[in-house]
Structures are given as structure tokens and as C-alpha cells.
């Protein structure tokens, strides 16, 4: 057991052009605060991963508010160390997140508001025990400085905390097979001391609290022996009884991952997959739970009511993340329709509509004909938001009210002369020609392309079509 | 300006399913968590739960097991279904919406009363 | 769950007299998520307060709440007679949402 320390050193803009506009104004207040999250390994693993090693959040910060026209300077921090206590052993790698937050201070809708000003994330090998390291990040036009370090919780020593001390029982020398503490030279290794239980003649351990099985052996404290009668997955040598393979102890046997976690085996001992809200070799140890505010931007924290369940967040429209932490372009997801502008707000999101649709979401088509009378007998026609009038013969113009000139349009055809007439028009067709717009050509032997025309009619005559 | 209006059946029997439908009006659905609460005739406020349009749903544990909420976007509705009502599922059940800036009620139907009795 | 306890069960007070109605949390409310409602008689509840200190839109300013972590509370100045109704605190930090009993304001 142990801990994990981090010392914000500043945070303010880089080096370099583009410096950052300060994150608080006369207007918006702010404070800052940190957040550091630690993984096992050097995993690249997503921000929303969990933090199997732990997570930690300062304090807030003294609130800042920006001198008008001055750059961003180092902002104020907020007081003392992150620690991330840790029970088992320390990995020796880890990959570490640590976000800056700032909290605005302003009138904002339902209290303040957090957001997430930058991210910074690493690999590193670090022994407990070790001096602080130093270490310099940048995100965008921001750079964190800061130190950490890993110790070891007495009794508790060595580079992975996994050897345990204790007082010499006597001045000059330590037990049988037990050697002196370094750097504590007055103090004894300490033997082992395996999970609580554990079959003095079946098992052992390597870290405290472990039980791990000899051969032929099983069960969370090495008390049952392993069935001969299958041997269906053999691992360990042959039974000099039986004459077949006796599965050997497999580290997973009796699962020791608590909280639903999920056991693999390894080439040394086991790992754990726990599941969201645990953390810890054996996924024992729960890292944040509603009691600790985890939601941000006005989520609602559902279960983690207790250590031993795991949070989630439900997120206001408009943020999203496992923490709420990330604001949302609302209107990225289109949600007016028919061509609405959409508005964002913050508080709400309005849709402003084209002609011819309504609703909250332009979802409405109007009845762009409702109340909508065409004069003379014209019908009206919806159509894309907007009405028209289809006009009777004779009439046009958007309510047909207007008297059309019917021979505006120049409809008769191959240099036919058209006639205005109260039922419409008549066109006179050019020599050659016939038909209600003199579309037809007369063939030369005075037979036409149509059946023969009507009685009293000869070809080339005025052509009335009612 | 938004609107919201309760409706269903205002009598049930024992062990039947209380069903009510909301019909919001003045915004869409697809914006806001949507939520039922009820109150016995005389006495304080009790969430039943929510949902929002993408699924989400969250339920009072103490009606979890009987309770289901749904959403009709086509009809900017939301309804509540809880089962094997009784006696003591008598109340004044209103709909309403869920603020955008966190989980409280900014806008509630007028509220139904609905009595459990054969 | 988060209980929430309001006092005094009933305040009997004049018009024009200041109402202070208290809101108690078992366990601490997250960032003051804390909302306050008024019911009148056959009506739905109407916001009051969010964010224990935020006033709703239209609410007269002589609603005025304050307060953090379990303990909250509601100030009426100057009573008017439409004021007169029954007052709710909810929790909105941790799930599930909680109300409080409610403090009735009577005309005394």
C-alpha cells in the first residue's frame, strides 16, 4: 500500500506565439481545480477508461478574474497535493491523465458551470520510494508544470511496496531467511503475511494477502484438492496415482476479482478487468461515488451510492461524457427540420422556420392554402411552404384576379396571327397549316397529317377550339 | 410557449395497469428529459421517472419493478404504464419537463387524478 | 436515497410578515442541486428556486433561497396573500430525485 502524490507547479500559457486568452473575464469569474486519474501499465487507453489505479481532485483554486487588456498570466492554484492512496502493489509503470477544470463563477443557469480547459497525458516508469520527478506538459497553447512521486505506506517498503518492516526483535540481527530494511537499516524484513486463512501446508504467497495453491490443490484458501477423476484440462505434471495429468493451481481458480471483475491469467500471476467505479488488483476498491459529485454541468448521478457500485452519469441535453464534462453543439444534430435555422441557446434551442412551416422543430407543413381563395374560379395548389393559384382560362396573376392576355404567350405556332376571344383564343394559321395553335403542317396533295377537318372548314381557315 | 396535458383512463381496478399519455405542446420532445410524478390526494410529491428521447431511462427504485416510460416523437408524446396497481397508487399524476440545465421540473401538466378502487 | 426533511410542517404568518422555511438533507446535496416549489390547491406545482439560490423566470424577487451541503432555505419577504400555498424542496444531485414533505404557509 501506498501513495501516489502530485504537486501542481503552474498552469498558465506556453512558450511561443499564440498565447491563450485568459480562461476568466471581469464578467466570468473562475477558479481552477485538477483532476488526475492513474492506470497500470502503459497503456494508451481512452480519457474514459477507468482509473484502475485511482483518481484524485484538488481542491478549487482562488477565484481569478482577468485584468482587462493584460495576457493570461500563471493562473491561480489551488492549495496542496493531489494524493491517490493505492493498496496493492505499486505497478512501477503507470500512465496518468491530469485535467485542468475551471469552474466559471458567473450568473449561470443552474449554478456554476465546469468545463474542461486541458488534458494532459503520459507513460512513465517511477519506483516508490523514488525522489519527486519533475515534469513539464503542454496542451495547446497551455503548459503544466508539476512533480510526483510514489511511497510507501509503513510497514510497507521497497520499490513496489510490497515488502513489509517491522521493528528488530532483537538489537543486532534479524530473524532466520530475513534481511534488514533498506533505507530503514534498524528495522526487519517482515515475513509475508498471506490472505487471512490461507492452508499454512498448501498454500504461499507472494504479496500480501495472497493465497496461490501448491499442486493438487485449489479453492480461495488451497483447502480443496483438485479433483483427479476428468482430467480433462490438464496443467499440472502427471498424478503418479492415477497415471493421468491433475490440473495444477491456476491463478483465476475461485476468481479472485471482486465486483464482477473479470480474471485472465498471466505469465506470472492474474490481472483483473473491472468494471466501471473499481479499481485495484483484485478490483476491491471503488474510486468515486455519488457522494462525491462526479457529474458535472448539472448530471444526475445514478447509483454508486456505496463504494461497492459503480456511477454513471445522466447528462442535460447539450453535454455528454462520463462526467457530463463535455459541452455539445446541439445544433450539430439537426434537429429542425424543413431547412429551420437552429439557435442554441444555451438555456433552450430554437428553430427559426422558412415560409410555410411552424413548430418547435419546423416539423409543421401549414396549409399554405388554408384561407387562400383564387379569384375566377381558379383552384388553389400547395407546394413547398408556399400556395399558387391555378388560374382559369383567361385569368393569371398570383390570386387569379388579373385578366390574362391569352395572346401573350405567343401560342400560335409557324407564324399563325392569334385572336384574344372571350372563350380564350383563335389562332389564324399561315398558308400550309392547321390545328388549334396551327401546329400541323398541310401535306401539298391537300391531304393532312390529321383526319379531314370538320365540315366548312378548309384547311387554312381561322380554327376556333372553345 | 410550452404546454403539457395529461390524459387517461381516471378510474383502474386492483392488479390492472394504470396507462397515461402527456401530449406536449410549444416544444419538441426530442430536447428535454420527459417525467412523471405523482402525489396522493393530501400528501407530498414522489418522482416516478424519466426519459429522454435517445433511451435513457431512470426509474424510482422503489416502483422500478411495475413502471415503464415511453416516448412517441411522431405525436410529441410520452406516456407511463405501471402495473398491478393498488389502493395505494391513488393519486394526482402530472407529467412535466426537465430543465436543460440540470434535473428539476421547470414546466408540469395540470395533473390527472387517477383512483385505484373495483 | 437522499431524504429530505422540511420545518416547520406549517408557518402561520400575516401578509406583509418575512417566511423562512428550512430544508434538511440526510446527506449532502451535490453543488446545491436543491429546487423549491409552490402548490396551490388543486393546481400542479410551479418553480421557485434552482441551484438553492437561482430565482425561475418571473418569480418575484422576494423569493430568495440560500444555503449549501444539507441545510437549505427558502425566504418569502414580505408575504403577499397569493403566497400562501404549500412549499417543496427536491434534491437533484443523486438519483433517485427526492422531494421534501413540504411546509404549508397559512394565513395566520
Known amino acids: 500500500a501506498g501513495v501516489f502524490e502530485l504537486q501542481i507547479h503552474s498552469f498558465g500559457p506556453g512558450p511561443g506565439p499564440g498565447a491563450p486568452r485568459s480562461p476568466c473575464s471581469a464578467r466570468l469569474p473562475c477558479r481552477l481545480f485538477f483532476r488526475v486519474c492513474l492506470k497500470p501499465g502503459l497503456s494508451e487507453e481512452a480519457a474514459e477508461s477507468p482509473c484502475a489505479l485511482g483518481a484524485a481532485l484538488s481542491a478549487r483554486g482562488p477565484v481569478y478574474t482577468e485584468q482587462p487588456g493584460a495576457p493570461a498570466p500563471d493562473l491561480p492554484l489551488p492549495d496542496g497535493l493531489l494524493q491517490v492512496p493505492f493498496r496493492d502493489a505499486w505497478p512501477g509503470t503507470f500512465s496518468f491523465i491530469i485535467e485542468t477544470w475551471r469552474e466559471e463563477l458567473g450568473d449561470q443557469i443552474g449554478g456554476p458551470a465546469w468545463s474542461l480547459l486541458a488534458r494532459v497525458a503520459g507513460r512513465r516508469r517511477l519506483a516508490a520510494g523514488g525522489p519527486w520527478a519533475r515534469d513539464i506538459q503542454r496542451a495547446g497553447a497551455w503548459e503544466l508544470r508539476f512533480s510526483y512521486r510514489a511511497r510507501c505506506e509503513p510497514p510497507a517498503v521497497g520499490t513496489a511496496c510490497t515488502r513489509l518492516c517491522r521493528p528488530r526483535s532483537a538489537p543486532s540481527r534479524c530473524g532466520p531467511g530475513l534481511r534488514p530494511c533498506a533505507p530503514l537499516e534498524d528495522e526487519c524484513e517482515a515475513p509475508l503475511v498471506c490472505r487471512a486463512g490461507c492452508s499454512p501446508e498448501h498454500g504461499f504467497c507472494e504479496q500480501p494477502g495472497e493465497c496461490r495453491c501448491l499442486e493438487g490443490w485449489t479453492g480461495p484458501l488451497c483447502t480443496v484438492p483438485v479433483s483427479t477423476s476428468s482430467c480433462l484440462s490438464p496443467r499440472g505434471p502427471s498424478s503418479a496415482t492415477t497415471g493421468c495429468l491433475v490440473p495444477g493451481p491456476g491463478p483465476c481458480d475461485g476468481n479472485p476479482c471482486a465486483n464482477g471483475g473479470s480474471c485472465s491469467e498471466t505469465p506470472r500471476s492474474f490481472e483483473c478487468t473491472c468494471p466501471r467505479g473499481f479499481y485495484g488488483l483484485r478490483c476491491e476498491v471503488s474510486g468515486v461515488t455519488c457522494a462525491d459529485g462526479p457529474c458535472f454541468n448539472g448530471g444526475l448521478c445514478v447509483g454508486g451510492a456505496d463504494p461497492d457500485s459503480a456511477y454513471i452519469c445522466h447528462c442535460p441535453p447539450g453535454f455528454q461524457g462520463s462526467n457530463c464534462e463535455k459541452r455539445v453543439d446541439r445544433c450539430s444534430l439537426q434537429p429542425c427540420r424543413n431547412g429551420g435555422l437552429c439557435l442554441d441557446l444555451g438555456h433552450a434551442l430554437r428553430c427559426r422556420c422558412r415560409a410555410g412551416f411552424a413548430g418547435p422543430r419546423c416539423e409543421h407543413d401549414l396549409d399554405d392554402c388554408a384561407g387562400r381563395a383564387c379569384a375566377n374560379g381558379g383552384t388553389c395548389v400547395e407546394g413547398g411552404g408556399a400556395h399558387r393559384c391555378s388560374c382559369a382560362l383567361g385569368f393569371g396573376g398570383r390570386d387569379c384576379r388579373e385578366r390574362a392576355d391569352p395572346c401573350a404567350a405567343r401560342p400560335c405556332a409557324h407564324g399563325g396571327r392569334c385572336y384574344a376571344h372571350f372563350s380564350g383564343l383563335v389562332c389564324a394559321c399561315a398558308p400550309g397549316y392547321m390545328g388549334a395553335r396551327c401546329e400541323f403542317p398541310v401535306h401539298p396533295d391537300g391531304a393532312s397529317a390529321l383526319p379531314a377537318a370538320p365540315p366548312g372548314l378548309r384547311p387554312g381557315d381561322p380554327q376556333r377550339y372553345l | 410557449q410550452v404546454q403539457l396535458q395529461e390524459s387517461g383512463p381516471g378510474l383502474v381496478k386492483p392488479s390492472e395497469t394504470l396507462s397515461l399519455t402527456c401530449t406536449v405542446s410549444?416544444?419538441?420532445?426530442?430536447?428535454?428529459?420527459w417525467s412523471w410524478i405523482r402525489q396522493p390526494p393530501g400528501k407530498g410529491l414522489e418522482w416516478i421517472g424519466y426519459m429522454y428521447y435517445s433511451g435513457i431511462t431512470n426509474y424510482n427504485p422503489s416502483l422500478k419493478s411495475r413502471v415503464n416510460i415511453s416516448l412517441d416523437t411522431s405525436k410529441n408524446q410520452f406516456s407511463l404504464k405501471l402495473g398491478s396497481v393498488t389502493a395505494a397508487d391513488t393519486a394526482v399524476y402530472y407529467c412535466?419537463?426537465?430543465?436543460?440545465?440540470?434535473?428539476?421540473?421547470?414546466?408540469w401538466g395540470q395533473g390527472t387524478l387517477v383512483t385505484v378502487s373495483s | 436515497e437522499i431524504v429530505l426533511t422540511q420545518s416547520p410542517g406549517t408557518l402561520s404568518l400575516s401578509p406583509g410578515e418575512r417566511a423562512t422555511l428550512s430544508c434538511r438533507a440526510s446527506q449532502s446535496v451535490t453543488r446545491s442541486y436543491l429546487a423549491w416549489y409552490q402548490q396551490k390547491p388543486g393546481q400542479a406545482p410551479r418553480l421557485l428556486i434552482y441551484?438553492?439560490?437561482s430565482r425561475a423566470t418571473d418569480i418575484p424577487d422576494r423569493f430568495s433561497g440560500s444555503g449549501s451541503g444539507t441545510d437549505f432555505t427558502l425566504t418569502i419577504n414580505r408575504l403577499e396573500p397569493e403566497d400562501f400555498a404549500v412549499y417543496y424542496c427536491q434534491q437533484y444531485g443523486t438519483s433517485p430525485l427526492t422531494f421534501g414533505g413540504g411546509t404549508k404557509v397559512e394565513i395566520k
Open positions: 412535466a419537463r426537465l430543465s436543460v440545465a440540470g434535473f428539476y421540473f421547470d414546466y
Open positions: 410549444g416544444d419538441s420532445i426530442s430536447s428535454y428529459y
Open positions: 441551484g438553492a439560490s
